[in-house]
Interface confidence: medium
Amino acid sequence: RTVPPMVNVTCSEVSEGNITVTCRASSFYPRNITLTWRQDGVSLSHNTQQWGDVLPDGNGTYQTWVATRIRQGEEQRFTCYMEHSGNHGTHPVPSGKVLVLQSQR
């Protein structure tokens, strides 16, 4: 069986004019998935991205995420690329985004 992922892109504000954009894929099967950030259509280098492992979400399907830090104002240049079971798609950073403020630690 194949269950395509639901993909969601969110932003959170960080210091010094940078924001963290996170791309989450959920409710997909099988487990193999490609999830990576692209800038102007080109995949970012591995060391500029952070990934979560691909883990069960409790419904017989899986979830994972990838995040990267970008300059605020350059959101339109970045897309999250997803490939799963022969299907693929790109997901932009939402332009009318609501920033989730991270609490100071």
């Epitope: 193999n32 490609t34 492992d53 883990l55």
Partner: antibody, heavy 119, light 108 residues
Framework: QVQLQESGPGLVKPSETLSLTCTVS????????VHWIRQPPGKGLEWIGM???????DYNAAFISRVTISVDTSKNQFSLKLSSVTAADTAVYYC?????????????WGQGTLVTVSS | EIVLTQSPGTLSLSPGERATLSCTAS???????LHWYQQKPGQAPRLLIY???NLASGIPDRFSGSGSGTDFTLTISRLEPEDFAVYYC?????????FGQGTKLEIK
């Protein structure tokens, strides 16, 4: 830095169980999974199986009836057990970290340990 | 299972020359899941190129990869003495995750 170290008996008798451990440092076992791969002397690489961070496993069908891969997070160790061994199981056994992200490649390897199956 | 066939089995070249190594899959492999490893005698393999064309950390840019579908290539633009080793392609597209039989790159 990231390190993986395989250990276990270098000699195993036919029909017995091969048991190896992979002790890791420099990364969290709750964040990265591990593959086990073997290489018979003078031959190529063969994937045995892997364990994900939630403890679930994927095995090569060629080994599935006699292989078990597990993790002990308290000891920072992964383990491989291969039962009912024969001379054909003589090989260098490697553990390798399952890289993250969009490729799942084996980004760091142990140095390998040679296991000889002989009576 | 997906069988990866590497050619040639042995490649004899001199330092400074260009090396082209081929990996052919028995069925289509996503470029995201095709990787190359280098192995020197007595050592463990090390990740060279991941996802067909991305250099792993610390790998010099004389190495490059390309391809799609069933045909993939590893190219070393100008051979250095330390490049003589065995090279394996590897697919993570479908279990069991298989390796090619290897190409031995030796000094001519």
């Amino acid at each position: 830095q990231v390190q993986l170290q395989e250990s276990g008996p270098g000699l195993v008798k036919p029909s017995e169980t091969l048991s190896l451990t992979c002790t890791v440092s420099g990364f969290s076992l709750t964040t990265y999974g591990v593959h086990w791969i073997r290489q018979p002397p003078g031959k190529g690489l063969e994937w045995i199986g892997m364990i994900w961070t939630d403890g679930t496993t994927d095995y090569n069908a060629a080994f599935i009836s006699r292989v078990t891969i597990s993790v002990d997070t308290s000891k920072n160790q992964f383990s491989l057990k291969l039962s009912s061994v024969t001379a054909a199981d003589t090989a260098v056994y490697y553990c390798a970290r399952k890289g993250h992200g969009y490729y799942y490649a084996m980004d760091y390897w142990g140095q390998g340990t040679l296991v000889t199956v002989s009576s | 299972e997906i069988v990866l066939t590497q050619s040639p089995g042995t490649l004899s070249l001199s330092p400074g020359e260009r090396a082209t190594l081929s990996c052919t899959a028995s069925s289509s492999v996503s470029s995201s899941y095709l990787h190359w490893y280098q192995q020197k005698p007595g050592q463990a393999p090390r990740l060279l190129i991941y996802s067909t064309s991305n250099l792993a950390s610390g790998i010099p840019d004389r190495f490059s990869g390309s391809g799609s579908g069933t045909d993939f290539t590893l190219t070393i633009s100008r051979l250095e003495p330390e490049d003589f080793a065995v090279y394996y392609c590897h697919q993570y597209h479908r279990s069991p995750f298989t390796f090619g039989q290897g190409t031995k790159l030796e000094i001519k």
